[in-house]
Interface confidence: low
């Protein structure tokens, strides 16, 4: 029986050109997490495999950074990044858990005040 629950950062907004952190956490289960997939609609953004580590899809490697934790950092946001993002936890023996985040990227009205940040 699947007893786990996924907590996410929910519905979030960010400015065009900025960066955002997407985070999920799987709780209430003792199942082993074997892999976490991050997907945008039907596109695979990144994979974090328990044994092999992170893999960022080539088409996103310039704008997606792994972490913190099993989360994902999206950089240089465009309005086309608006939409649903999914964290998909592959676990044993439970199976698959999915969390949903909706990101809205807003046109920047004060882009000259923008502050970038980095994930060490």
């Amino acid at each position: 029986m699947m007893t786990g629950t996924i907590e996410t950062t929910g519905n979030i907004s960010a400015e065009k050109g900025g960066s955002i952190i997407l985070q999920c956490h799987l709780s209430s289960t003792t199942a082993q997490v074997t892999q976490v997939n991050w997907e945008q609609q039907d596109q695979l953004l990144a994979i974090c495999n328990a044994d092999l580590g992170w893999h960022i899809s080539p088409s996103f490697k310039d704008r997606v950074a792994p972490g913190p934790g099993l989360g994902l950092t999206l950089q240089s946001l465009t309005v086309n990044d608006t939409g649903e993002y999914f964290c998909i936890y592959h676990t044993y023996p439970d199976g698959t858990y999915t969390g949903r985040i909706f990101l809205e990227v807003l046109e920047s009205s004060v882009a000259e005040h923008g502050a970038r940040f980095q994930i060490p």
């Epitope: 004060v110 923008g114 502050a115």
Partner: nanobody, 117 residues
Framework: EVQLVESGGGLVQPGGSLRLSCAAS????????MGWFRQAPGKEREYVAS???????WYADSVKGRFTISADNSKNTTYLQMNSLKPEDTAVYYC???????????WGQGTLVTVSS
């Protein structure tokens, strides 16, 4: 709009401790997370720690085991307990919340932490 007010910074000797607080008011939400970033002179703003409202936490490698982030949801406040401080922790510390928050410029005013003997 979310207003974020940080406090608790100051001058501390290496090995000492400080506790930062960040109070959020205005258009706050019950979901999402709150986090801390810092910016040292001449460097980029960098991630320090964050906490989901349910209590799960993340830390930058440079502060793991020394810093503890927590949140009091009833007060819309997050805290950063900083122990075993090092000179390289000297920076202006900023808090943020990701719900209704525009990452480009909606930061609090920051609180300065100086670690020096």
């Amino acid at each position: 709009e979310v207003q974020l007010v940080e406090s608790g910074g100051g001058l501390v000797q290496p090995g000492g401790s400080l506790r930062l607080s960040c109070a959020a008011s205005g258009n706050t939400f019950s979901g999402g997370f709150m986090g801390w970033f810092r910016q040292a002179p001449g460097k980029e703003r960098e991630y320090v720690a964050s906490v989901l409202r349910g209590g799960y936490t993340w830390y930058a490698d440079s502060v793991k085991g020394r810093f503890t982030i927590s949140a009091d949801n009833s007060k819309n406040t997050t805290y950063l307990q900083m122990n075993s401080l090092k000179p390289e922790d000297t920076a202006v510390y900023y808090c943020t919340t990701d719900r209704g928050y525009n990452w480009n410029y909606d930061w609090g005013q920051g609180t300065l932490v100086t670690v020096s003997s």
